[in-house]
Amino acid sequence: EPTMYGEILSPNYPQAYPSEVEKSWDIEVPEGYGIHLYFTHLDIELSENCAYDSVQIISGDTEEGRLCGQRSSNNPHSPIVEEFQVPYNKLQVIFKSDFSNEERFTGFAAYYVATDINECTDFVDVPCSHFCNNFIGGYFCSCPPEYFLHDDMKNCGVNCSGDVFTALIGEIASPNYPKPYPENSRCEYQIRLEKGFQVVVTLRREDFDVEAADSAGNCLDSLVFVAGDRQFGPYCGHGFPGPLNIETKSNALDIIFQTDLTGQKKGWKLRYHGDPMPCPKEDTPNSVWEPAKAKYVFRDVVQITCLDGFEVVEGRVGATSFYSTCQSNGKWSNSKLKCQPVDCGIPESIENGKVEDPESTLFGSVIRYTCEEPYYYMENGGGGEYHCAGNGSWVNEVLGPELPKCVPVCGVPREPFEEKQRIIGGSDADIKNFPWQVFFDNPWAGGALINEYWVLTAAHVVEGNREPTMYVGSTSVQTSRLAKSKMLTPEHVFIHPGWKLLEVPEGRTNFDNDIALVRLKDPVKMGPTVSPICLPGTSSDYNLMDGDLGLISGWGRTEKRDRAVRLKAARLPVAPLRKCKEVKVEKPTADAEAYVFTPNMICAGGEKGMDSCKGDSGGAFAVQDPNDKTKFYAAGLVSWGPQCGTYGLYTRVKNYVDWIMKTMQENSTPRED
């Protein structure tokens, strides 16, 4: 507890003090007072630097004194032998004695009293900026007229803060301008404009005179502009050293003028105005700005339109343009949106064709579709080359965005038929010689594949079984071979309307219009053993002449077997119809005259006993295309005959091309279109 006075005596005083003692006293007087410590008696063993025994006076970290030996008063009217005056309210006294004393020493007697200190004069640092007033136990500061005492109760300043300027134009000056500004003041001015306007400050050099910087370049008095996280200044000196036009890029500006105690000058004067916030003319690649201006400011709106082949992608939606507004913060809205190259995406796959994985799917990239050659070709032209267009579609010069269509190549066998050893009027054949050959198991017959979805056959083959099972791709019709080949499932059978349906088909004598189409449920995949035959053209080039050669194939009756195990084939010439009429019917079911011969029939055969027979019905009579020697077309279909091994009659397919095309078109699926 602080006291105003007190006494300090060495141990055993006034008797001799003991050896090896260390004792300390902490003196504390009230705040605002100093301490006067005085010794009235001092008798301590003397040693150099008081090393043996001593009394030590410490103020804070400073040793005020160290005493030893004997002292007596110099003044007969005063008992004080030694005294100390400190301007602080705390003091420590420490007494130490060593292990031996040569004589008997009595120690010391000391007294302390609280003394008033003059804070206004006793310290190096003046506590008040202007006037200092001392009183017992403290002091107070006071200010000259028009100044006020700051909250720290030490500093005086002028009342120059708190002004807020909201007008779009204005003038601000230092206090008393152009008279000297007040010392020791901090003046803060706030400019607060509507959002979207930036504060622009203008000064004239001659309107600025502020105490110059010290030798280290630090302003003693300073003017600072703060706009958000940007600072302009500090500025000081004679004549404004900064830019005469300060664009703050902010609608809020704080002006801070700080002065010290000395060196007042005339100060400063500035003007400000609000400019609509400018937005930078940004370089947005691959786009055009509308309207185009040299400068854009707050509330300006531009339409940014992507160049062809570029788009702005927001989420999953692609657009070709977007609007951007110059915002109050000087930034464009939608600034994250960019015109990126259009991405056409992974190209769609096509049936029976392929497209190489593109290196890029962006605008301008090129891809190429190819068909699975040699079994398919590109029907709708265009060469298969597509480029990624500006609208995000893969586009072909001819077809536009329409995909290429790979359709089967017709009439081209993978291996040409060569007549090998003679086998009862024909030769062994391989399915690769006749990849269009279709096998019907009930009744045992043939047919010709004409495209992915359609099989052409004779009407008499399907009239009794409208759900025939068919196979393609096998030379042998042994069960194990057919199990490995492709089974075709019919969707619908279309018999020519001119074919007369009989109650007893076995007694038929009229085979006119012996033609039918079978629509398949699923498309047939083409390859070396499965490939369609062409249809005849409608021009006169496809009119057959006597002697024209055609190929027939099938698993029908041979001289040795009722049914061939492996495919057989023969090359035979077209003959005049009368040759067929002249042959006697082997097992007539009616009078010979009852058999009907029409222009819808082709007569062929008669050479070396080569002929089609029971079980070959519906198969193609394949003739080389007069306009493309690499291809075969179905000139006829095995229909009927008077006698195996002589002449046979074949349905003249050319006469039915219109019906075939019409039937296929009317019964196609969207998938096939």
Partner: antibody, heavy 119, light 107 residues
């Protein structure tokens, strides 16, 4: 009329081999696919293998792989089946069977050859 | 290889009964399934091929159905001549497999 005539019954010791023949009459062997099927007394039918004329290779059931050999002599229209390393469980009637056409699996069966394996 | 499982292994029935035998393949064989009838000491006789096609000369009381892995042989009205063992057979590739057989005996 096509017929399959098989060789007569055989009695063999364990470890020995047996070769059963099957002669085709009324047709040529080249036009046919010959299969071999066996049936142990009181047991079910077991398919052993066949010669595939299209591929020119013989296909054997996994069970008989390495022990059975099927050959054909087209000059005499005779098919052969040889089974080696005989054991008692090989005692069975061995049939040669022609493959059918157009979905019919087996067309014609031989009369069967009884092979007895006994020590 | 494909496994063929026939059920039941034995079936007791009377003349005039409707009899059904089933055959299950371990994997799909489409419609490549045949049914045979075998009498003691005789070679098997083909009844049905391609799951449902009746071999010529076989009485119409025999019928077959199914595709994929499940197949059925039905005798609509059992006759005295029908007491025999029946086998199913898969032949969708060159590895042909028989079922273990179903013996139809007189009740």
């Amino acid at each position: 009329e096509v017929q399959l005539v098989q060789s007569g019954a055989e009695v063999k010791k364990p470890g020995a081999s047996v070769k059963v023949s099957c002669k085709v009459s009324g047709d040529t062997l080249t036009e046919l696919s010959m299969h071999w099927v066996r049936q142990a007394p009181g047991k079910g039918l077991e398919w052993m293998g066949t010669f595939d004329p299209e591929e020119g290779e013989t296909i054997y059931a996994q069970k008989f792989q390495g022990r059975v050999t099927m050959t054909e002599d087209t000059s005499t229209d005779t098919a052969y089946m040889e089974l080696s390393s005989l054991r008692s469980e090989d005692t069975a009637v061995y049939y040669c069977v022609t493959e059918g056409l157009a979905g019919v699996p087996f067309d014609l069966w031989g009369q069967g050859t009884l092979v007895t394996v006994s020590s | 290889d494909i496994q063929m499982t026939q059920s039941p292994s034995t079936l007791s029935a009377s003349v005039g009964d409707r009899v059904t035998i089933t055959c299950r393949a371990s994997q799909s064989i489409s419609s490549w399934l045949a049914w045979y009838q075998q009498k003691p000491g005789k070679a098997p006789k083909l009844l049905i091929y391609k799951a449902s096609s009746l071999e010529s000369g076989v009485p119409s009381r025999f019928s077959g159905s199914g595709s994929g892995t499940e197949f059925t042989l039905t005798i609509s009205s059992l006759q005295p001549d029908d007491f025999a063992t029946y086998y199913c057979q898969s032949y969708n590739s060159y590895v042909w497999t028989f079922g273990q057989g179903t013996k139809v005996e007189i009740k």
